[in-house]
């Protein structure tokens, strides 16, 4: 019998057949098709695209393709009452107003329903007051302002530049500092790469370009009105005052032409150091307020957006497994965009479409995967990962029992320099082995493997000779699967050279200029990087769904657990006196990590030795691997973040996009020297060490011999 009883194609040929079927030309064609009009969540256009994808996935050969709808809280600008910011003089006259829309890109002048730039879920309001420039509005920026510079943001409107951290964290920080409004802007230092022209002549952000985006602090809750449960037809909805994560102050984004007009008049304190200066020809004074002649002028925000419960649609496609149909490998990416979605999300959606087509082709030839593959086109990701979270809430019992892995598929590119991978340590070996088998698309690496170019261009900071693989944070649809449910997850895309391009994300992110032409002209004319990303994402799904023994290596978790324990211990040891005073010991954690290492190694030995022809033993071993990620879930969640339940990883409390290791301990230690009750604070550190040590030990025991 072949090593894969799910197929009539020989095993070696399987993966090759699947990969060979993926075509750059198809991805290009799909991207074009998905980007001709806006597909904003909750709109008719996005519903029509959902139905189109449903129909095409059926044609491609999936066993079933269904729409899953939910009624969730979304946010839109008021069409007749636009949002803007003005400078007003002492008489209250508006002497400057920010633009109401982005100048449309060439060829798109007559497209209707382009949503103007706005900060989704901003409350309505017309605050006026003095401006304070708060740099990136990070935690450390407010520390600098309040503690070092003694500048009080209370009652002020703050202006912050986009970049470095998730915009929702900026707004939360501003709220906590007492601000009454937030203006977000894109500084050329972060969104204009030197030596590159602005769109349409290059991939840089023009002065009138603006980044849209939600400003929620959901902490994994999904729909703000139905946290923990699906927003279905019989849902009980919270009142808006009890909704999760909504900002309490008006927020609005602007481009750098408009920002120039606000920042050039700033007075008050000089910037504390060069890290607070962007690239505009302004002094970057912190304020508060305008300088000299302009000191009587104020800034006024005019925000009229509304929050509305709106229907959204996920597309869920199923390719039934031949041997283990009750084990699910999920490939999911979102479909909704802010405008055209040339990169985010359609460069990812086009890749998913081609992966589905390739799997469908194999299925039509008589092949089936060993395990079931679920394909998802999520809605309302841009509004807080709502489609994926609601679906996972609705199906949580199935997912926690049957979910093998989740592979995310948002934007395939954010640059064209090298591969970028974030995943669970369980997938490290899978990613390494797969990329060693794929050809690099990079210039200068002809005939070399993707692993080789990736390692050369993005070396691991800890382990020389290996590529960097990052921790999963959030800000994308894997969040509910990994952080809440404990399903092994990963993501891959092509990225920029972080060494030479310090700007945040890619310059045209969430702007009207994120078009098909942006990708086709400037990022990937041959679609070779898209194809490589399709091979990585598709190859991972193929292996996860098809390999007899799940391609998870628990020994790699042992390696990182030790690294993370070392790191958090070092952070704690910055307070040696308090460690002594309050008898803080990490012995239990280091002991648990050592036990995990030992048990994982023994498990790996058994994994090599067991009789793979015995389906019961095979299933037992695979279940131990599948449930290992689940074992890191604490049912009680992290403090004040009940939907972040993974004890080893969580989104950083200071930047949703970034992953933090041992987040419970990390947060307990953060800024501990400023806590009013040190005894209580160090007590919480001890409690978090206890929780972490117990969880690691408990996870280790799931790998022990069952009897």
């Amino acid at each position: 019998k072949s090593s894969n009883e799910a197929t009539n194609i020989t095993p070696k040929h399987n993966m090759k057949a699947f990969l060979d079927e993926l075509k750059a030309e198809n991805i290009k064609k799909f991207l074009y098709n998905f980007t001709q009009i806006p597909h904003l969540a909750g709109t008719e256009q996005n519903f029509q695209l959902a139905k189109q994808i449903q129909s095409q996935w059926k044609e491609f050969g999936l066993d079933s393709v269904e729409l899953a709808h939910y009624d969730v809280l979304l946010s839109y600008p008021n069409k007749t009452h636009p949002n803007y910011i003005s400078i007003i003089n002492e008489d209250g006259n508006e002497i400057f107003n920010t633009s109401l829309f982005e100048p449309p890109p060439p060829g798109y002048e007559n497209v209707s329903d382009i949503v103007p730039p706005f900060s989704a879920f901003s409350p309505q309001g017309m605050p006026e007051g003095d401006l304070v420039y708060v740099n990136y509005a990070r935690t450390e920026d407010f520390f600098k302002l309040e503690r070092d510079m003694k500048i009080n943001c209370s009652g002020k409107i703050v202006i912050a530049r986009y970049g470095k951290v998730f915009r929702g964290n900026k707004v939360k920080n501003a709220q906590l500092a007492g601000a009454k409004g937030v203006i977000l802007y894109s500084d050329p230092a972060d969104y204009f790469a030197p030596g590159v022209k602005s769109y349409p002549d290059g991939w840089n952000l023009p002065g009138g370009g603006v980044q849209r985006g939600n400003i929620l602090n959901l902490n994994g809750a999904g729909d703000p009105l139905t946290p923990g449960y699906p927003a279905n037809e019989y849902a009980y909805r919270r009142g808006i005052a009890e909704a999760v994560g909504l900002p309490s102050i008006p927020v609005h984004p602007i481009g750098y032409y408009d920002a120039q007009k606000l920042l050039e008049k700033m007075g008050g304190s000089a910037p504390p150091d060069s890290s607070w200066r962007g690239s505009l020809k302004v002094p970057y004074n912190v304020g508060p307020g305008f300088t000299g002649n302009f000191s009587t002028q104020k800034v006024k925000m005019h925000i009229h957006s509304t929050n509305e419960v709106t229907r959204i649609y996920n597309v869920i496609g199923t390719l039934r497994g031949a041997v283990e149909p009750d084990r699910y490998v999920i490939l999911g990416g979102h479909r909704d965009s802010w405008v055209f979605g040339g990169i985010d999300p359609q460069s990812g959606a086009a890749v998913v479409h081609e992966i589905v087509r390739s799997f469908g082709t194999l299925k039509k030839e008589g092949w089936r995967p060993r395990r079931t593959i679920l394909f998802a086109s999520w809605d309302a990701e841009e509004f807080g990962l709502l489609g994926s979270t609601e679906w996972a809430e609705e199906n949580s019992r199935l997912l926690q029992e049957r979910g093998v892995a989740y592979i995310n598929a948002d934007s395939s590119i954010e640059g064209n320099y090298t591969l970028r991978v974030d995943c669970t340590p369980l997938m490290y070996s899978l990613v390494h082995n797969l990329t060693k088998e794929l050809k690099s698309p990079d210039e200068g690496f002809e005939g070399k493997s993707l692993y080789e170019s990736w390692t050369k261009k993005s070396p691991s900071p800890e382990f020389s000779g290996m590529p960097r693989i990052s921790k999963l944070g959030s800000g994308n649809d894997f969040e509910v699967f990994f952080q809440r449910l404990g399903i092994a997850s990963g993501r891959a895309r092509y990225t920029k050279n972080w060494e030479t391009n310090k700007f945040s994300g890619y310059p045209l992110y969430h702007s009207v200029y994120e078009t098909y032409e942006l990708v086709e002209k400037f990022y990937d004319p041959m679609f070779k990087y898209h194809l490589t990303v399709a091979q990585v994402r598709g190859g991972m799904v193929f292996e996860l769904a098809n390999s007899i023994v799940l391609p998870f290596d628990c020994r790699d978790y042992a390696v990182v657990l030790r690294k993370y324990a070392d790191k958090i211990y070092s952070i704690s040891m910055k307070h040696p006196q308090e460690m002594k005073t309050y008898s803080v010991s990490f012995d239990s954690l280091f002991s648990a990590v050592k036990n995990f290492t030992e048990i994982a190694s023994k498990f790996s030995e058994r994994l090599q030795d067991f009789d793979k022809s015995n389906p019961i033993v095979l299933r037992m071993m695979n279940d131990q691997l599948m449930f290992l990620e689940r074992a890191f879930i604490d049912p009680l969640g992290l403090p004040d973040r009940p939907f972040y339940r993974h004890v080893i990883y969580a989104p950083s409390s200071h930047n949703k996009y970034a992953g933090e290791s041992f987040p419970g301990i990390y947060d307990a230690l953060f800024d501990i020297e400023s806590k009013v009750d040190p005894s209580k604070a160090w007590g919480e550190v001890k409690r978090q060490i206890y929780v972490a040590a117990f969880t690691v030990q408990a996870a280790a025991e799931t790998l022990s011999e069952v009897a």
């Epitope: 490290y428 070996s429 390494h432 800890e462 382990f463 020389s464 000779g465 290996m466 290596d553 628990c554 020994r555 790699d556 042992a558 390696v559 030790r562 690294k563 324990a565 070392d566 211990y569 070092s570 040891m573 040696p576 990490f586 012995d587 280091f590 050592k594 290492t597 030992e598 048990i599 994982a600 190694s601 023994k602 790996s604 030995e605 090599q608 030795d609």
Partner: antibody
Framework: EVQLVESGGGLVQPGGSLRLSCTAS????????MSWVRQAPGKGLEWVSA????????YYADTVKGRFTISRDNSKNTLYLQMNSLRAEDTAVYYC??????????????WGQGILVTVSS | QSVLTQPPSVSAAPGQKVTISCSGS????????VSWYQQLPGTAPKLLIF???KRPSGIPDRFSGSKSGTSATLGITGLQTGDEADYYC???????????FGTGTKVTVL
């Protein structure tokens, strides 16, 4: 019974290269971190490098970082140490050692007999 | 330059007891497991103690290990001539992400 056998040592000129091998038997090689430890003539033990079980994360002592590369071939049960830009102070007996716990280095429960590397002009 | 410090030598008569100290810091001995190795003249090192105080099978109970804070101690009772050797402590260092050995102690049986 665990056996670790080093090979590939010898005399090399300063600036030259050498590749040491360690062939393992008697245990499931891929599950354990493996290390290289050296001992200069008349001196104490110095840990040089380790490689984890699983995906093979490498660790190095500062004295060899950037010059030495540790690797493993699990299919051949063999550990390697590629030594480049050798210096006189790299002269030592090099031991291959198996970890006693698992995928990361904790303690060395089995050692090879050692192989002499001499760097001299 | 070793980060773990041991006395260069200790000596005692047969049947007596010797102790060897190993002094480190919070980043190595303080939060990691200590092991001890015996190296008889002209041979490879041999594991004597692991996890601070455990003996591998075949190691007599005359050998004992302990750890307190950032120091560890190896004890040898009922000293025998066959115990003449160099002894090394070793542990992981969390800050260096590296394994570290002690400077080594020569035990002489008088």
């Amino acid at each position: 019974e665990v056996q670790l056998v080093e090979s590939g040592g010898g005399l090399v000129q300063p600036g030259g290269s050498l590749r040491l091998s360690c062939t393992a038997s008697g245990f499931i090689f891929s599950s354990y971190a493996m290390s290289w430890v050296r001992q200069a003539p008349g001196k104490g033990l110095e840990w040089v490098s380790a490689i984890s079980g699983g995906y093979g994360a490498p660790y190095y002592a500062d004295t060899v970082k950037g010059r030495f590369t540790i690797s493993r071939d699990n299919s051949k049960n063999t550990l390697y140490l590629q030594m480049n830009s050798l210096r006189a102070e790299d002269t030592a007996v090099y031991y291959c050692a198996k970890d006693g716990v698992g995928a990361t280095p904790y303690y060395f429960d089995d050692w090879g007999q050692g192989i002499l590397v001499t760097v001299s002009s | 330059q070793s980060v773990l410090t041991q006395p260069p030598s200790v000596s005692a008569a047969p049947g007596q007891k010797v102790t060897i100290s190993c002094s480190g810091s919070s980043s190595n001995i303080g939060n990691n497991y200590v092991s001890w190795y015996q190296q008889l003249p002209g041979t490879a090192p041999k594991l004597l103690i692991f996890d601070n105080n455990k003996r591998p099978s075949g190691i007599p109970d005359r050998f004992s290990g302990s750890k307190s804070g950032t120091s560890a101690t190896l004890g040898i009772t009922g000293l025998q001539t066959g115990d003449e050797a160099d002894y090394y402590c070793g542990t992981w260092d969390s800050s260096l992400s590296a394994y570290v050995f002690g400077t080594g102690t020569k035990v002489t049986v008088l």
